[in-house]
């Protein structure tokens, strides 16, 4: 056997080159036949009136033909025949790759609530071979479940992703990425997650700066509530007691001037949105005012006392339930 061919893999619409090569040529006629065993070329003559076939090279040792605008119907075995005695035959297989026609991502809900499980589907249509679909949430790869549908040698792949969403997922892209031998580079489509979540509440002491509250001083607390949708109502209450008469409420701020021991207690900031409500507590302890020591007649001694305030916040952020957030001064 001195007749040689090579298999060809080509992307739909591109050009396939078929070559029949003879190692030891004796000027025997070379013929190329299609999968239906119709003669495409006999020497340099083309009996088939398909102008997509063009002669690239013709000699006693090679018949080289190009096939332009390849379609899936061109796939199959092409036969090279050498009219020796006995005749020789060799075949080359043309494999046609078809990239996915289009890529569609479909998200079950435009807006999800934290903790909810949503379904995301991605479909890669009419490819050959079947497309591999990969899922990413941001930079993290996730596992989907794929179903392949075959129709007329073409494959449509649908991958389903079940995704439990968290508040951190808000604004993060869910990416459907395809891997296919006919696709170079990244073919992907994405949708951004919109996640609604109950408020997160933080209390910040904006005055006094050193964090030590003494009789006669002023206190200013600011309540920061972040949620989606943004909390519409932020309220201050005093737990198990009335708000002091001299307390001033201004939006998220609570001012108490001229602190005294009767102001001791727990002050709560509450915030809510359509997802749920949350609160944070601040435990106020009013210290004695600094004592003034009369100066001795002969010597002066300065004593510096440093008090450290530790603020501990414990958060329970279960939707729809009240959280117990306590700020404790030691």
């Amino acid at each position: 056997q001195n007749l040689f061919t090579k298999d060809v893999t080509v992307i739909e619409g591109e050009v396939a080159t078929i070559s029949c090569q003879v190692n030891k040529s004796d000027d025997s006629v070379i013929q190329l036949l299609n999968p239906n065993r119709q003669t495409i070329y006999f020497r340099d003559f083309r009996p088939l009136k398909d102008s997509r076939f063009q002669l690239l090279n013709f000699s006693s040792s090679e018949l080289k033909v190009s096939l332009t605008n390849v379609s899936i119907s061109d796939e199959g075995r092409y036969f090279c025949q050498l009219y020796t005695d006995p005749p020789q035959e060799s075949y080359t297989t043309i494999t046609v790759l078809v990239p996915p026609r289009n890529l569609m991502i479909d998200i079950q809900k435009d807006t999800a609530v934290e903790g909810e499980e949503i379904e995301v589907n991605c479909t890669a249509m009419a490819s050959k071979p079947a497309t591999t679909i990969r899922w990413f949430k941001g930079n993290t790869e996730l596992k989907g479940k794929s179903e392949v549908e075959e129709w007329s040698d073409m494959y449509t792949v649908t991958s389903q992703l079940m995704l439990k969403v968290h508040k951190e997922d808000d604004g993060v892209p869910v990416i459907c990425q395809v891997e296919h031998p006919a696709v170079t580079g990244n073919l992907q489509t994405q949708r951004y997650l919109e996640v609604q979540y109950k408020p997160q509440v933080h209390i910040q002491m904006t005055y006094p700066l050193q964090g030590l509250t003494r009789e006669g001083d002023a206190l200013e607390l600011t309540c920061e509530a972040i949620g989606k949708p943004q909390p519409v109502m932020v309220t201050w209450v005093r737990v198990d007691d009335e708000m002091p008469q001299h307390a001033v409420l201004s939006g998220p701020n609570l001012f108490i001037n001229n602190l005294n021991k009767t102001d001791n207690g727990t002050y709560r900031c509450e915030a809510s949105n359509i997802v749920g409500k949350a609160h944070s507590d601040y435990m106020l302890y009013v210290y004695d005012p600094p004592t003034t020591i009369p100066p001795p007649t002969t010597t002066t001694t300065t004593t510096t006392t440093t008090t450290t305030t530790i603020l501990t916040i414990i958060t329970d952020s279960r939707a729809g339930e009240e959280g117990s957030i306590r700020a404790v001064d030691h």
Epitope: V29, R43, D44, F45, R46, P47
Partner: nanobody, 121 residues
Framework: QVQLVESGGGLVQPGGSLRLSCAAS????????MYWVRQAPGKGLEWVSA????????YYADSVKGRFTISRDNAKNTLYLQMNSLKPEDTALYYC??????????????WGQGTQVTVSS
């Protein structure tokens, strides 16, 4: 220009014979390989036979091997196809063709208008 005119077609009974002729002009007939190609109703073109420049080498499709004979007369610029033991599946339009160049280096496939062969009882 290259001109190929086929003749000799007609209606014949299964098992009968016909001889097709192709008169060539406009090119150096003796310098080019010649071919017979046919097209059955509703089918694609099918290569039938080929002959080299001198007529010493002939080639046939498996479907006609042993029944058809190709020949040429370079003095008369004529190509022939002797068809024996005809079958209904031989019913087709038969074309004479060549790949020749006229006054240029470029080679072109040239076809006649065809002659109809019908095999029927």
């Amino acid at each position: 220009q290259v001109q190929l005119v086929e003749s000799g077609g007609g209606l014949v009974q299964p098992g009968g014979s016909l001889r097709l002729s192709c008169a060539a002009s406009g090119f150096t007939f003796s310098s080019y390989w010649m071919y017979w190609v046919r097209q059955a109703p509703g089918k694609g073109l099918e290569w039938v036979s080929a002959i080299n420049t001198g007529g010493g080498s002939t080639y046939y499709a498996d479907s006609v091997k042993g029944r058809f004979t190709i020949s040429r007369d370079n003095a008369k610029n004529t190509l022939y196809l002797q068809m024996n033991s005809l079958k209904p599946e031989d019913t087709a339009l038969y074309y004479c063709a060549t790949r020749a160049s006229v006054g240029t280096l470029e080679m072109y496939d040239n076809w006649g208008q065809g002659t109809q062969v019908t095999v029927s009882s």
